[in-house]
């Protein structure tokens, strides 16, 4: 089943998805679709990334965290209710069938009122020190191994954590760090 | 210590083509980006396109498919643009620059720049 | 593409003042975005990178900020070495670009 998220009408929704990239340069492609992961691929793509950029983005849609460390959460910009629904996470790890693919459910709230101030990047720019990458040691003796070698136990606990979308509400609006 | 040691300058006529080459050291060359940057004279900074020597993959400025080419040899540890078709356009200075993955594949260290000039 | 946009073009500063530098990008880009100073004859050098961070050895009056459309170099206490042009540029989506510069001049 799907993890719920939650957003109100006018503010910035967060959607969260991270692997582990295994060397510099060796990003794995990742795509962001809009309803359940299907087979292959993501349906009506809203972003994509590929060995080394966002090579492609619809309007309102776009990677605050690091990207190119393996945070590829989507944060969805001034958010109606027509964004609720199905969004598909799917890291495109090279080899048949080896694909991770995370289905997470919008859920689009009325404003109560007029939409406060959101200190969602705040909380968005938090989570990636939730993700510990490999140490790569140092930066000029790196050597590159010929496939990615994703550990994907981050995603796993990171959706748990927040599988309670009040408490991911709560953090975002007081503007909590989690370390 | 890092070095990105760029090609002289180069006079050459319209309509010519044109390589120029950046070679590294003091790094593991496979393990990076080679970007590309041009600089006309007294203005701003164009992209043009990177290659990873790791695997030979490259990716170009829309603006300079079919004028630039880039290529790598892996044994001298050595990057290469070929300009075609050369006009007065394409009289400024190229810089080879290494994408670094840990500046998030901004620039931390650019060659001293190749002057390019076409003229009749 | 995404266009960088700075401003000022031109920024006259007295020594020992504060020197503010504007990027705006046409799109968002997360914290993709980079500082360069170039001075005349050298090619550009890397001051800050993913929007905030400092690169080895910049001295500490630089410092970057912001997040998605707007971005911000400031030179804390300006030095008679730092009369350069600076860039920003945005390394989020290819085509890179960067901004026409602001050149940085003493008062």
């Known amino acids: 089943s799907e993890v719920e998220y939650r957003a109100e009408v006018g503010q910035n929704a967060y959607l969260p998805c991270f692997y582990t990239p295994a060397a510099p340069g060796n990003l794995v492609p990742v795509c962001w679709g809009k309803g359940a992961c299907p087979v292959f691929e993501c349906g009506n793509v809203v972003l994509r990334t590929d060995e080394r950029d966002v090579n492609y983005w619809t309007s309102r849609y776009w990677l605050n965290g690091d990207f190119r460390k393996g945070d590829v959460s989507l944060t969805i910009e001034n958010v109606t209710l027509a964004d609720s629904g199905i969004y598909c996470c799917r890291i495109q790890i090279p080899g048949i069938m080896n694909d991770e693919k995370f289905n997470l459910k919008l859920v689009i709230k009325p404003a109560k009122v007029t939409p406060a101030p959101t200190r969602q990047r705040d909380f968005t720019a938090a989570f990636p020190r939730m993700l510990t990458t490999r140490g790569h040691g140092p930066a000029e003796t790196q050597t590159l191994g010929s496939l990615p070698d994703i550990n994907l136990t981050q995603i796993s606990t990171l959706a748990n954590e927040l599988r309670d979308s009040r408490l991911a509400n709560d953090l975002r609006d007081s503007g909590a760090t989690i370390r | 210590q890092v070095q990105l040691q760029q090609s002289g300058p180069e006079l050459v006529k319209p309509g010519d083509s044109v390589k120029m080459s950046c070679k590294a050291s003091g790094y593991t060359f496979t393990d990076y980006y080679m970007d590309w940057v041009k600089q006309s004279h007294g203005k701003s900074l164009e992209w043009i396109g990177y290659i990873y020597p790791n695997n030979g993959g490259t990716s170009y400025n829309q603006k300079f498919k079919g004028k630039a080419t880039l290529t790598v040899d892996k044994s001298s540890s050595t990057a290469y643009m070929e300009l075609h078709s050369l006009t007065s356009e394409d009289s400024a200075v190229y810089y080879c620059?290494?994408?670094?993955?840990?500046?998030?594949?901004?620039?931390?260290?650019w060659g001293q720049g190749t002057t390019l000039t076409v003229s009749s | 593409d995404i266009v960088m946009t700075q401003s000022p073009d031109s920024l006259p500063v007295s020594l020992g003042e504060r020197a503010t530098i504007n990027c705006k990008a046409s799109?968002?880009?997360?914290?993709?975005v980079a500082w360069y100073q170039q001075k005349p004859g050298q090619p550009p050098k890397l001051l800050i990178y993913y929007a905030s961070n400092r690169y080895t050895g910049v001295p500490d009056r630089f410092s970057g900020s912001g997040s998605g459309t707007d971005f911000t170099l400031t030179i804390s206490s300006l030095q008679a070495e730092d009369v350069a042009v600076y860039y920003c540029q945005q390394h989020y989506s290819s085509p890179y670009t960067f901004g026409q510069g602001t050149k940085l001049e003493i008062k």
């Open positions: 620059a290494r994408g670094g993955y840990y500046s998030y594949y901004s620039y931390d260290y």
């Open positions: 799109q968002s880009v997360g914290n993709n």
